[in-house]
């Protein structure tokens, strides 16, 4: 199990790419328009 | 209007230092991300970071990561990177782009050139 | 990273007659929200990118339906209806959907 695990990860693969791949959605969404789905869109005065 | 306005670019050695900043003005600058994107002269375009709206989220390129850091205010409107240990292959037109509804950069500045040259 | 493909990278077209771009990427641009955030951009002649689509097929606010997007997955493609004198310039594939956000090469279009 543990050796399966390991060879993953030293599959061309690190942590932090992982991370980005898996980074939630709430998350992701705060990098562009953040209100977009919760108060309708726009964002302009 | 919507619109960013990017300044600070110039002509630097490399090795040194330079703080750009991008303006924004006509909408809601705290409720979008922003992001910096490149040009190289004659070149095609390539994203370099974001900073999430309220700047607890960032991300980099590995081309400056470790070297570059994004930042904002949002009391003054305004997004900043602050480029360290600049390379020659540095050298481009650094463009502020707003992350807009769809995942999209809808918004562009005009640009600032930085030029890292001995 | 994702790797983003576009062909032609140069492409003369004659004025009123159509256009079209193909756009590739390496892996699947369908993000776990069930979109796909790619985009399409133009830049002309000394001057900064402007958003045309956004993911896939949506006309930005301004941009003129001779321009649409369509695609899924890993293939993508910008067409103009029209060519017109003030479509010169290279337009751009971009891929929103993972870190690190990437850019296709871009395609050239100009008049014959």
């Known amino acids: 199990k543990h050796k399966c695990f390991r060879n993953s990860l030293e599959n061309n693969e690190t942590l932090e790419s992982i991370m980005n791949t898996l980074e939630s959605e709430e998350d992701f969404r705060k990098y562009f328009y953040y209100l977009e789905g919760s108060k309708g869109g726009g964002g302009s005065k | 209007q919507v619109q960013v306005v990017e300044s600070g670019g110039g002509v630097v050695q490399p090795g040194r230092s330079l703080r750009l900043s991008c303006a924004a003005s006509g909408f809601t600058f705290s409720n979008y991300g922003m992001h910096w994107v490149r040009q190289a002269p004659g070149k095609g375009l390539e994203w370099v970071t974001v900073?999430?709206?309220?700047?607890?989220?960032?991300n980099y390129a590995d081309s400056v990561k470790g070297r570059f850091t994004i930042s904002r205010d949002n009391s003054k409107n305004t997004l900043y990177l602050q480029m360290n240990s600049l390379r020659a292959e540095d050298t481009a037109m650094y463009y502020c782009?707003?992350?807009?509804?769809?995942?999209?950069?809808?918004?562009w500045g005009q640009g600032t050139m930085v030029t890292v040259s001995s | 990273d994702i790797v983003m493909t576009q062909t032609p990278l140069s492409s003369p077209v004659t004025l009123g007659q159509p256009a079209s771009i193909s756009c590739r990427s390496s892996?699947?641009?369908?993000?776990?929200?069930?979109?796909?955030?790619l985009s399409w951009l133009q830049q002309r002649p000394g001057q900064p990118p402007r958003l045309l689509i956004y993911k896939i097929s949506n006309r930005f606010s301004g941009v003129p339906d001779r321009f649409s997007g369509s695609g899924a997955g890993t293939d993508f493609t910008l067409k103009i209806s029209r060519v017109e004198a003030d479509d010169v310039g290279v337009y751009y594939c971009m891929q929103t959907t993972q870190f690190p956000f990437t850019f296709g090469p871009g395609t050239k279009v100009d008049i014959k």
């Open positions: 892996q699947s641009l369908v993000r776990s929200d069930g979109n796909t955030y």
């Open positions: 782009a707003r992350g807009g509804s769809g995942f999209a950069f809808d918004i």
């Open positions: 900073i999430s709206y309220d700047g607890s989220n960032k």
